[in-house]
């Protein structure tokens, strides 16, 4: 689950579960910073606006990131 706060990492738990790119409203990638030493990925789902922290090391999540970036590059002129 994500928690909002000013300091430290946002994600308290992370999921390995694959996410369907079509069900994604938004994918937030937070790079490492002075507050949090690792990348954090927060998916916002279209259904109910539910959020989920994703495991950046998971194969399924890496594939999701590839799919999303491919989709974005198709859209951009």
């Amino acid at each position: 689950i994500p928690l909002s706060r000013t300091v430290r990492c946002t994600c308290i738990s992370i999921s390995n579960q694959p996410v369907n790119p079509r069900s994604l409203e938004k994918l937030e990638i937070i790079p490492p910073s002075q507050f949090c030493p690792h990348v954090e990925i927060i998916a916002t789902m279209k259904k109910k606006g539910e959020k989920r922290c994703l495991n950046p090391e998971s194969k399924a999540i890496k594939n999701l990131l590839k799919a999303v970036s491919k989709e974005r590059s198709k859209r951009s002129p």
Partner: antibody, heavy 121, light 109 residues
Framework: QVQLVESGGGVVQPGRSLRLSCAAS????????MHWVRQAPGKGLEWVAL????????YYADSVKGRFTISRDNSKNTLYLQMNSLRAEDTAVFYC??????????????WGQGTTVTVSS | EIVLTQSPGTLSLSPGERATLSCRAS???????LAWYQQKPGQAPRLLIY???SRATGIPDRFSGSGSGTDFTLTISRLEPEDFAVYYC??????????FGPGTKVDIK
């Protein structure tokens, strides 16, 4: 199967220390935030502390702040609660619980059976 | 800190009856952040409802949750003998503490 087993409870004198452990099995412990929740005899549930999956984030109830420390060893699939300066009002059953990771907040979906801490002179 | 109030303190009903339990927050709670638990004597709590209205895995459909803002409800449509227990609501706001309500005891009339 998914399981949490607490240990380390017992009878201790006021002002002394105790360390509780919670052994996790059947799931990817290193992906899950973990909580300690306690229940005084005949009373309701009280959230005590939370630690993030990576050990970076720690949160405490005001009643234990500065006295209790939550920690974890992901290589051993174990959660800990170090309790110092114990008081009579800390007497309770202590449960560890898993923070369900498959959503924004899906509650504490797996609980241990609890370990009893009695603070008495 | 958000304070949760549960009512009634005790609910005396017979098997087959409908139970309606209330949980009120001292300030608005996002629906995503409210859960209900059941606890039987000598046992650990069990997650029933998360996100105010979603049933946890394996929870029978006689249990349902509703509400938003400061008022939330747990409904048990037809009480089974195994449903007599204490029920707690819990809020999980954007930062701790993650408070529990004081509980509602559902006992046999």
């Amino acid at each position: 199967q998914v399981q949490l087993v607490e240990s380390g409870g017992g009878v201790v004198q006021p002002g002394r220390s105790l360390r509780l452990s919670c052994a996790a099995s059947g799931f990817t412990f290193s992906n899950c935030g973990m909580h300690w929740v306690r229940q005084a005899p005949g009373k309701g549930l009280e959230w005590v502390a939370l630690i993030g999956y990576d050990g970076i984030n720690e949160y405490y109830a005001d009643s234990v702040k500065g006295r209790f420390t939550i920690s974890r060893d992901n290589s051993k699939n174990t959660l800990y609660l170090q309790m110092n300066s114990l008081r009579a009002e800390d007497t309770a059953v202590f449960y560890c619980a898993r923070d369900w990771p498959e959503g924004y907040y899906n509650g504490m979906d797996v609980w241990g059976q609890g370990t009893t801490v009695t603070v008495s002179s | 800190e958000i304070v949760l109030t549960q009512s009634p303190g005790t609910l005396s009903l017979s098997p087959g009856e409908r139970a309606t339990l209330s949980c009120r927050a001292s300030q608005s709670v996002s629906s995503s952040y409210l859960a209900w638990y059941q606890q039987k004597p000598g046992q650990a709590p069990r997650l029933l409802i998360y996100g105010a209205s979603s049933r946890a895995t394996g929870i029978p459909d006689r249990f349902s949750g509703s509400g938003s803002g400061t008022d939330f409800t747990l409904t048990i449509s037809r009480l089974e003998p195994e449903d007599f227990a204490v029920y707690y609501c819990q809020q999980y706001g954007s930062s701790p503490p993650f408070t529990f309500g004081p509980g509602t005891k559902v006992d046999i009339k």
